[in-house]
């Protein structure tokens, strides 16, 4: 069969080889397409409801006034010339539609190095067959699932036209110390060959390099966290980062209902104050960072060091 590629909505003429150029003609077209369940026969004398889709012209050719998705399939003509010689023509018709130029929507203006970022979503509307979307960084193809690159794809089909809408969401983790203004673009490659790719306008987000956070230090006074009943313990959370982050306090893994402060004072220690304390620093551009945990315990008179102690109620400390 001869392969024919036709654009959706355009007319198509299929020649019936060996057919006399003018009536009377002995010929028959047979179609097996999305509009038929088996073979549909069309003859020159035809003329009827199928004319809107396909009709035999006076010269024996089959005319499709506006090719649609349902017209994909096999078209055969059997013709007999004046001398009784039979000729067969066989066509395999495939249809296509080029979408509009793809676009990048919801694009990020800034990316953060070292963490996953959504770059944007590439959208292509009105293709057939579906085709594919691919991303490029500085003109080179980006390979999903490699070097911090991930792509989420979605394909939808219009219920009436049958045309496809493709969406591709790009996530990247920019390397620290890399290009501060990378260029991303997206391209649509048609499902049928011999058609060039369509590329979006590029986007150039800035890459922000976060200053690495030094460890959050928790200093305990008295050292070791062991104190006699009625004594005072001072916990200080030290974070070198600028601007100063918010500091919250945890006891036994549970946040203490206190306003943010870098210093926690536990005056007149009682059994209810025993437990494990830590501080959490929250910076606007980072996730929360927790310090090491320290254990606060009560030394009964005559003992040499921290005891297990019993954990009492939730006595709250005061903040400096």
């Amino acid at each position: 069969a001869q392969n024919i590629t036709a654009r959706i909505g355009e007319p198509l003429v299929l020649k019936c080889k060996g057919a006399p150029k003018k009536p009377p003609q002995r010929l028959e077209w047979k179609l097996n397409t999305g509009r038929t369940e088996a073979w549909k026969v069309l003859s020159p004398q035809g003329g009827g409801p199928w004319d809107s889709v396909a009709r035999v012209l006076p010269n024996g050719s089959l005319f499709l006034p506006a090719v649609g998705i349902q017209d994909e399939g096999i078209f055969r003509c059997q013709a007999m010339n004046r001398n009784g010689k039979e000729t067969k023509s066989n066509y395999r018709v495939r249809v296509y539609q080029i979408p509009g130029k793809p676009e990048i929507v919801d694009s990020a203006s800034e990316l953060t190095a070292g963490v996953p970022n959504k770059v944007g979503t590439c959208v292509s509307e009105g293709s057939y067959p579906a085709g594919t979307l691919s991303w490029h960084l500085d003109g080179k193809p980006l390979v999903p699932n490699e070097k911090g690159v991930s792509v989420k794809e979605q394909t939808r089909r219009h219920p009436e036209t049958g045309l496809f809408t493709l969406q591709s969401e790009l996530m990247v983790t920019p390397a620290r110390g890399g290009d501060p203004r990378p260029t991303f673009s997206c391209s649509f490659s048609p499902g049928l060959p011999r058609h060039r790719a369509l590329r979006t306008a590029p986007i150039q987000p800035r890459v922000w390099e976060p200053v690495p956070l030094e460890e959050v230090q928790l200093v305990v006074e008295p050292e070791g966290g062991a104190v006699a009943p009625g004594g005072t313990v001072t916990l200080t959370c030290e974070v070198p980062a600028q601007p100063s982050p918010q500091i919250h306090w945890m006891k036994d893994g549970v946040p203490l209902p206190l306003p943010p402060s870098p210093v926690l004072i536990l005056p007149e220690i009682g059994p209810q104050d025993q437990g494990t304390y830590s501080c959490v620093a929250t910076h606007s551009s980072h996730g929360p960072q927790e310090s090491r945990a320290v254990s606060i315990s009560i030394i009964e008179p005559g003992e040499e060091g921290p005891t297990a102690g019993s954990v009492g109620g939730s006595g709250l400390g005061t903040l400096a």
């Epitope: 509009r35 549909k40 009827g48 409801p49 199928w50 809107s52 889709v53």
Partner: antibody
């Protein structure tokens, strides 16, 4: 909303002529074939004529061929049926309907107009 | 010309009944059969298109099926508003041919 409104029916003598009109709205008229269907009193439905979207091709059953002519004016969103040499058996309610080809077949109908052929 | 033989020509049924109407085409018409409902003094309304597809706004108790050249309209549970006359139509070839109609009456 798709609307089809027929007009032009009435009483006519055998051998006489009548022109029916159908005003279409609510859709892109020139994208669709159009069809006339009739129904004699107490009887079933009978196809009368179809026309393609451009108006270049028309189709009729033998019962009305050479007597009836279907036409359209896409600029006016209007469909017509010119009926000549009318006979008593042409007495019916005439409906205009959208479609008539294999893509869309008679999905919307007008309310009908009555044609009575009698002396 | 294609003949569409519709049966029965009339039937009596009660609300809630399952009703089946058949049209047989005299030759292959593919999937190109519609079903219509008509009430007295009103225009026909398309129920099913291309043999099996439910038209917009038509209740799901109506369904269409095809086996070769036999086409069936089924009303799964007859409602009071379903008492009407039903027609099939082949539109694969000219002349377009309607079935003779089936009048569904209250038992």
């Amino acid at each position: 909303e798709v609307q089809l409104v027929e007009s032009g029916g009435g009483l006519v003598q055998p051998g006489g002529s009548l022109r029916l009109s159908c005003a279409a709205s609510g859709f892109t008229f020139n994208n669709y074939w159009m069809t006339w269907v009739r129904q004699a009193p107490g009887k079933g439905l009978e196809w009368v004529a179809s026309i393609d979207n451009s108006g270049d091709n028309t189709y009729y059953p033998d019962s009305v061929k050479d007597r009836f002519t279907i036409s359209r004016d896409n600029a006016k969103n209007s469909l017509y049926l010119q009926m000549n040499s009318l006979r008593a058996e042409d007495t019916a309610v005439y409906y205009c309907a959208r479609g008539g080809d294999i893509r869309v077949s008679l999905d919307f109908w007008g309310q009908g107009t009555l044609v009575t052929v009698s002396s | 010309d294609i003949q569409m033989t519709q049966s029965p020509s009339s039937l009596s049924a009660s609300v809630g009944d399952r009703v089946t109407i058949t049209c047989r085409a005299s030759q292959d018409v593919g999937i190109y059969v519609n079903w219509f409902q008509q009430k007295p003094g009103k225009a026909p309304r398309r129920l099913i298109y291309r043999a099996t597809n439910l038209a917009d706004g038509v209740p799901s108790r109506f369904s269409g099926s095809r086996s070769g050249t036999d086409f069936t309209l089924t009303i799964s549970s007859l409602q009071p508003e379903d008492f009407a006359t039903y027609y099939c139509l082949e539109f694969d070839e000219h002349p377009l041919t309607f079935g003779g109609g089936t009048k569904v009456e209250i038992k």
